[in-house]
Amino acid sequence: EEELQVIQPDKSVLVAAGETATLRCTATSLIPVGPIQWFRGAGPGRELIYNQKEGHFPRVTTVSDLTKRNNMDFSIRIGNITPADAGTYYCVKFRKGSPDDVEFKSGAGTELSVRAKPSAPVVSGPAARATPQHTVSFTCESHGFSPRDITLKWFKNGNELSDFQTNVDPVGESVSYSIHSTAKVVLTREDVHSQVICEVAHVTLQGDPLRGTANLSETIRVPPTLEVTQQPVRAENQVNVTCQVRKFYPQRLQLTWLENGNVSRTETASTVTENKDGTYNWMSWLLVNVSAHRDDVKLTCQVEHDGQPAVSKSHDLKVSAHPKEQGSNTAAENTGSNERNIY
């Protein structure tokens, strides 16, 4: 009789996470009598996966009926595979012993590799907004994939970016891996509607990459341009001055009118108009009663946009050209929320 050999015909087995792995093992002889055990790894630290003789192994089932007469098939199935199950599995024949069975012979081992899909990429931008012409960094992270090979690309509005750095961790062998990439993006004034996309391709995705997106509207701040103009005379002693606040983003904006440096009125941008590029325009006006002034008036439109330091634009209102009304030192009524009468 030839001595028993333990045959593990598969050097390696590749299984998708969540699936069932079949690890094949047959013995070439019924002799010696004794159970089979399955281990992950070798040596003193090996992990018991299945013991025919005793124990409870809820994830493991045997392929054949071990009580079947003359059974020599000791293949097992392991259910609900995760990346943590990766490793080399050994089918080991034990010889009946007293009081304990004795290890007799091991199979050559089967390496179980687990294909695990990467998690949906998460793209995050800078903590604070930045203005056009500045370079900002975006990060993209995806976790839990195996094997290690993975491809990551960055796009801005469909155009592939080249300025990025990517790391896959850990560097050595692991049950699963993570990818971290940082891309640099130069902002332009037209980027309110722009998107940055991180695209991850992996063998488990069957050519259908995962994408994570970030809207540059969360990142960009387009500061306004101001223009103060004097409108044609509404009435003989009134002048309408407007402050055009153009091309700003985001909408959060507060405007203050100053007369000769003194605060006249403050208001918050409400009914704005949106431009095609996603920026906003807004206009505020001031009704000035010039008859109340003996000297020229310096009108300043001061805008605080998105919590940034205020920007302003001034307009000198010449009053010498207008006849002065004597004794008119009481306030005229406001004629609208954007109108202001000056004494």
Partner: antibody, heavy 119, light 110 residues
Framework: QVQLQQPGTELVRPGASVKLSCKAS????????INWVKQRPGQGLEWIAM????????HYNQIFKDKATLTVDKSSNTAYMQLSSLTSGDSAVYYC????????????WGRGTSVTVSS | DIVLTQSPASLAVSLGQRATISCRAS??????????IFWYQQKPGQPPKLLIY???NLDSGVPARFSGSGSGTDFTLNIHPVEEEDAATYYC????????FGGGTKLEIK
């Protein structure tokens, strides 16, 4: 280690039935066949039947087909053999034995239950 | 059914000598290269103990003075050298089909 525990004795009346137990420990009960063997005083061994605890598949010696009924209780890791319509010819020691190699052999034995049929 | 016939029914062997017990099957108990014969030892008041499986393989913890041989229908259990503790009844069993036992051989040590 493998152990098969059997009660020492059973005294029963002729015509009655008796249910013998065999409690297994030290191994996975459902992975190995249990055999039952009869031995009358001063006589040889007679194989009665065997049961696979995983699915209660049974094989009987034709001689005992109408005498013995094998069952298992997986929750308590116990095998049972019920003997019916007892006569003095059923007085014997009854052993349970476990087949460790799926060879239809008897690797580990209980100590046996002595059944006495007497009025 | 396969009938196993053991001989002799009893024998007496001097300490240190060889004891030979025969077991003959009514038809072959061989299959797929294996001989489905098992040998047991039983001492009074004790359950049987497996000595040899598949005709020639010593069970765990069985002294090397026990050996089994044979194929097809004729099988032999040898004990050499016999020791006092070997006094017992020896049974052969087959499992080519459903199991049956031989009638037993009682070994006495002189």
């Amino acid at each position: 280690q493998v152990q098969l525990q059997q009660p020492g004795t059973e005294l029963v009346r002729p015509g009655a039935s008796v249910k013998l137990s065999c409690k297994a420990s030290g191994y996975t009960f459902t992975n190995y066949w249990i055999n039952w063997v009869k031995q009358r005083p001063g006589q040889g061994l007679e194989w009665i039947a065997m049961i696979d605890p995983s699915d209660s598949e049974t094989h009987y010696n034709q001689i005992f087909k109408d005498k013995a009924t094998l069952t298992v209780d997986k929750s308590s890791n116990t095998a049972y053999m019920q003997l019916s319509s007892l006569t003095s010819g059923d007085s014997a020691v009854y052993y349970c034995a476990m087949d460790y190699g799926s060879l239809y052999a008897m690797d580990y034995w209980g100590r046996g239950t002595s059944v006495t049929v007497s009025s | 059914d396969i009938v196993l016939t053991q001989s002799p029914a009893s024998l007496a062997v001097s300490l240190g000598q060889r004891a030979t017990i025969s077991c003959r099957a009514s038809k072959s108990v061989s299959s797929s290269g294996y001989n489905y014969i098992f040998w047991y030892q039983q001492k009074p008041g004790q359950p049987p103990k497996l000595l040899i499986y598949l005709a020639s393989n010593l069970d765990s913890g069985v002294p090397a003075r026990f050996s089994g041989s044979g194929s097809g229908t004729d099988f032999t259990l040898n004990i050499h050298p016999v020791e006092e503790e070997d006094a017992a009844t020896y049974y052969c069993q087959h499992s080519r089909e459903l199991p049956t036992f031989g009638g037993g051989t009682k070994l006495e040590i002189k």
